[in-house]
């Protein structure tokens, strides 16, 4: 009788282990599905917003000519701002002309008023030269007004209608830029 009870107990334990394994597999499968779902949704969102609507810019981005701009709603240091833009398939704003600068400052006035926004401009520590993130030099009229006396790395930001410089480790809003999608119609 005791042997019978012990055999049943072992069988039950074995069953329990199998059920736990199945539950673990199911949880893992569910997690995997959720992850796949997340990517599918992101992919669908991107596809729908760009292809279906033939919209040149994603939702919440502003268009001007061939560019789309995203004005952040969070603060971050310059390097984190750069990474946040990369996550969206964009780079920190690179201002090519006075016309673009005027558009940006005009848009900022409408959206948020007079705050600081990181752009993709930084000063080389050795040469002191200002360079955009792709390595190109800013046009003479688009050099930051000397304002930062920082011993640390210095980066460029936009405030009101000026381009200024500050320690890259300070917290500011930021602006991302990507190319607008051409309509295939």
């Amino acid at each position: 009788k005791l042997l019978q009870v012990s055999t049943i107990a072992m069988q039950q334990q074995e069953k329990l282990i199998q059920q736990e394994r199945a539950l673990l597999n199911f949880t893992e499968w569910k997690r995997s599905c959720a992850l796949q779902m997340k990517y599918c949704q992101a992919f669908m969102q991107n596809s729908l917003s760009s292809a279906h609507n033939s919209s040149p810019c994603p939702n919440n981005w502003i268009q001007n000519r061939e560019s789309c701009y995203y004005v952040s709603e969070i603060w971050s240091i310059w390097h984190t701002s750069q990474e946040n833009c990369l996550k969206e398939g964009s780079t920190l704003l690179q201002i090519e002309s006075k016309e673009e600068m005027d558009f940006i400052t005009g848009s900022l006035r409408k959206i948020k008023g007079s705050y600081d926004y990181w752009v993709g401009l930084s000063q080389d520590g050795h040469s002191g030269r200002w360079l955009w993130q792709d390595g190109s030099s800013p046009s003479p009229g688009l050099l930051p007004a000397e304002r930062s006396q920082s011993a640390n790395q210095v980066c460029g930001y936009v405030k009101s209608n000026s381009l200024l410089s500050s320690n890259c480790s300070t917290w500011k809003y930021f602006i991302c830029e990507k190319y607008a999608l051409r309509s295939s119609v």
Epitope: A42, F43, L86, K87, G89, S90, D134
Partner: nanobody, 117 residues
Framework: QVQLQESGGGLVQPGGSLRLSCAAS????????MGWYRQAPGKQRELVAA?????????ADSVKGRFTISRDDAKNKNTVYLQMNSLKAEDTAVYAC?????????WGQGTQVTVSS
């Protein structure tokens, strides 16, 4: 999930060149940008260069004019290269590839680059 496979690291003399490559596989539709980071012993990890799915590039100040990041369009934009010229001793580090997604980021194992005579 996204898997990243780096190659091309090694030992090179100062002034020499190396070309690193990073091949992505898996759920690559979720990737918006790819980049290279480096970390030297006792130093913070830094972003060296990155490229977006549209081909926009960004570089660290210390490598501008010497390093070039590019993408292999023939391979569905899932292979990224870092051409490193005029290498200096201070470029010695472990170089790791990173894939940027809106929701998640993925890292490669890293490859050692040593610049020494």
């Amino acid at each position: 999930q996204v898997q990243l496979q780096e190659s091309g690291g090694g030992l090179v003399q100062p002034g020499g060149s190396l070309r690193l490559s990073c091949a992505a596989s898996g759920s690559i539709v979720s990737i918006n940008s790819m980049g290279w980071y480096r970390q030297a012993p006792g130093k913070q990890r830094e972003l060296v260069a990155a490229i977006t799915d549209q081909g926009r590039t960004t570089y660290a100040d210390s490598v501008k004019g010497r390093f070039t990041i590019s993408r292999d369009d023939a391979k569905n934009k899932n292979t990224v290269y870092l051409q490193m010229n005029s290498l200096k001793a201070e470029d010695t580090a472990v170089y790791a590839c990173k894939a940027f997604g809106r929701f998640d980021d993925y890292w490669g194992q890293g490859t050692q680059v040593t610049v020494s005579s």
